[in-house]
């Protein structure tokens, strides 16, 4: 007989990403003896919570907590029983709850309390349910992307850690209710609210980040609908042959459409609205979302928000990925350049409802929204953030890296569990368990 070294025990962590439209649960794992290594934490499993986001339960807070039960029960199975008590569990809510907190703080508190009550019933190490700021959402997304792609530090052949020369990737996240842009910058930000200083593995990072509330895909679509009702009586971004009846109360219930709300409107009135497949009018409608009229800084992205010039490579995820993936995969259109992205948006916007349904058989639920979505992504990147053709060449649209979803959740957990130390790692000897 001979002694056989057992592989090291695994540790686990759980994050509930409570987005504006739905909640996702991510379970992460890492070898217990390599907690401070880079790129060692990976996704173990995930679960999509059925139904809407927790912010949709403003009138029924217990419904929010009840909706999480199925995924929490799955977590009991996915994490070994002996690891339950030592597994941190976090819930982070983003722009949907930020909006609810603006309009109805009591409801927002009630939802978080109901969710907290349910999460404490489970044998995990529950460490709180809270609303993330836009800045946190942006920075943690950036941390996730760069951690997964091992841009912070790497273990070299010579047996020591080094910082890769390639630098860090910028991160762009398009959620349902907000969008975030985050990237490393050399010069100090003119607007201190847009700058975050990070110390990771002994390295100092100056990061620019900004979150635009109401510029998430779903809120943009709602704002465009409000604008179409107001200015056209038809929707230029919807396909010709697509006709809906709209309850006005639904359109103007969001804080993001409040500015467009008519003085005296009947919230229970139904209005018919049809699409017109008009790419040029749609572009104009989307352009109206961005203001370039005033900038109190040396340079701005839009709406008077400071932004240094975009630099380096970027990863664009969540709805950025889904929009571009639809253009590439479902529509078979090239999107390698900004010009191609614009042409693809125009192509989709030219399609009638019948043509779209024929091109993308089966799925009909959100098909009518892809024109506006594509036009918005193209305008946001080119006019909003200032990507030119050269800079756009450095943007990759990605959903996962190293089999792990790209988003703020992993970065959030890494930060709260101190899995990324501020100090540089010492010299270590590796142990081979094979």
């Amino acid at each position: 007989t001979r002694d056989v070294r057992e592989p090291p025990a695994l540790k686990y962590g759980i994050v509930l990403d409570a987005g504006s439209s739905h909640t996702s649960m991510f379970i992460y794992k890492w070898p217990a003896d390599k907690e401070n290594d880079t790129g060692i934490v990976g996704q173990h499993s995930s679960c999509d919570v059925p139904g809407g986001g927790i912010s949709s339960y403003a009138d029924n807070p217990s419904g929010a907590s009840q909706s999480l039960v199925g995924c929490l029960e799955q977590a009991l199975q996915d994490v070994p029983k002996e690891r339950h008590a030592g597994t941190p569990l976090y819930l982070g809510a983003t722009a949907g709850m930020r909006l609810l907190n603006l309009t109805n703080p009591e409801a927002s508190t009630s939802v978080l309390m109901a969710v907290t009550h349910t999460l404490t019933q489970y044998p995990f190490d529950f460490r709180g349910a809270r609303i993330l700021s836009g800045q946190e959402e942006g920075v943690f997304g950036w941390v996730t992307a760069n951690y997964l792609l091992e841009n912070f530090i790497k273990y070299g052949w010579v047996g020591r850690w080094f910082r890769p020369r390639k630098g860090t990737l910028g991160a762009m996240d398009l959620g349902g209710a907000s969008t975030q842009i985050t990237f490393e910058t050399t010069s100090p930000a003119e607007d201190r609210a847009s700058e975050v200083q990070l110390h990771l593995y002994g390295q100092h990072y100056r990061v620019y980040t900004h979150s635009f509330l109401c510029y998430g895909r779903d809120q943009v679509l709602q704002r465009l609908l409000a604008s179409a009702l107001q200015t056209h009586g038809f929707h230029p971004c919807w396909p010709r042959g697509f006709s809906t009846q709209v309850l006005l109360g639904d359109v103007y219930q969001s804080p993001c459409t409040m500015a467009q709300r008519p003085q005296n409107f009947n919230s229970s009135a139904r209005v018919s609205l049809s699409g017109s497949s008009d790419p040029h009018l749609c572009r104009d409608l989307v352009s109206g979302l961005f203001s370039f009229s005033s900038c109190p800084f040396s340079r701005c992205s839009f709406n008077g928000v400071f932004q240094p010039p975009v630099a380096g490579n970027f990863v664009a995820f969540s709805a950025f990925f889904y929009t571009v993936d639809f253009l590439r995969t479902s529509m078979g259109l090239p999107v390698a350049t900004l010009q191609q992205l614009e042409a693809a948006a125009v192509n989709v916007c030219n399609q009638t409802w019948a043509q779209l349904q024929a091109r993308v058989p089966g799925q009909r639920a959100r098909l009518a929204d892809y024109c506006a979505g594509a036009m918005f992504v193209q305008q946001l990147l080119s006019r909003g953030y200032g990507f030119d053709e050269r800079a756009f060449g450095g943007v990759i649209f990605q959903k996962k890296a190293a089999d792990t979803a790209v988003g703020w959740a992993l970065g959030y957990m890494l930060n709260l569990t101190n899995l990324i130390p501020a100090d540089p790692p010492g010299l270590r000897k590796g142990t081979d368990f094979s």
């Epitope: 949709s56 042959g241 009846q245 609205l273 799925q363 009909r364 639920a365």
Partner: antibody, heavy 129, light 111 residues
Framework: QIQLQESGPGLVKPSQTLSLTCTVS?????????WNWIRQHPGKGLEWIGY???????NYNPSLKNRVTISRDTSKNQFSLKLSSVTAADTAVYYC??????????????????????WGQGTTVTVSS | ETVLTQSPATLSVSPGERATISCKAS??????????MNWYQQKPGQAPRLLIY???NLESGIPARFSGSGSGTDFTLTISSVEPEDAATYYC?????????FGGGTKLEIK
């Protein structure tokens, strides 16, 4: 108030073409809506056949696509169903219905729900020699 | 296509009692946080009538005793306190993907 009324022969011979018409009153079929045909086999559930839109686009159930034609006559505010090469399996109550996409908001996200909220009374068609 | 299976086929309930009808889909009828499930009521000799859309939204003019719930593949229509006029066949219908499909129906009998 939108009203729909089906009409057509109640008896059709096998291998022939079934023809039905739906007359719409209280609303112009070119103004909006999707004008559907649905059938219900004796003692069975409902089966969607297809529609013609306010814009004259068609959408058919793949299981019937090669036998179905839905057309319209805007001057009479009518739309029609033709089902070719019928067999006894096509014996059913045939309904016409007006449908549309209802915009609904949930969880800060709007979406579109296809509903059929105006229906005719139905007409029975028997396929028999 | 998405196959919808309703149960029970027949349900016999006394007035004032609760009636629960189930509809199971062969694949999820949810998309991006929305459930594309509608419920219709069909009384003998009449055309179907829309009761509930988007799984849980009550159509205007429908009594509040009717409610819908569920997501993914499992949906329920509930009548909290059955009235004699509720005797009918109830159908679920999905609109998530083409073609729209209906369940086989549940016949509600009043004792």
């Amino acid at each position: 108030q939108i009203q729909l009324q089906e009409s057509g022969p109640g008896l059709v011979k096998p291998s022939q073409t079934l023809s039905l018409t739906c007359t719409v009153s209280g609303y112009s079929i070119t103004s909006g809506y999707y004008w559907n045909w649905i059938r219900q086999h004796p003692g069975k559930g409902l089966e969607w056949i297809g529609y013609i839109s306010y814009d004259a686009d068609n959408n058919y159930n793949p299981s019937l696509k090669n036998r179905v034609t839905i057309s319209r006559d805007t001057s009479k505010n009518q739309f029609s169903l033709k089902l070719s090469s019928v067999t006894a399996a096509d014996t059913a109550v045939y309904y016409c219905a007006g449908g549309y996409y209802r915009y609904g908001l949930g969880s800060y996200r709007g979406s579109y729900y296809y509903v059929m909220d105006y229906w005719g009374q139905g007409t029975t068609v028997t396929v028999s020699s | 296509e998405t196959v919808l299976t309703q149960s029970p086929a027949t349900l016999s309930v006394s007035p004032g009692e609760r009636a629960t009808i189930s509809c199971k889909a062969s694949q999820s009828v949810d998309y991006e946080g929305h459930s594309y499930m509608n419920w219709y009521q069909q009384k003998p000799g009449q055309a179907p009538r829309l009761l509930i859309y988007a799984a849980s939204n009550l159509e205007s003019g429908i009594p509040a005793r009717f409610s819908g719930s569920g997501s993914g593949t499992d949906f329920t229509l509930t009548i909290s306190s059955v009235e004699p006029e509720d005797a009918a066949t109830y159908y679920c219908q999905q609109s998530n993907e083409d073609p729209p499909t209906f369940g086989g129906g549940t016949k509600l009998e009043i004792k």
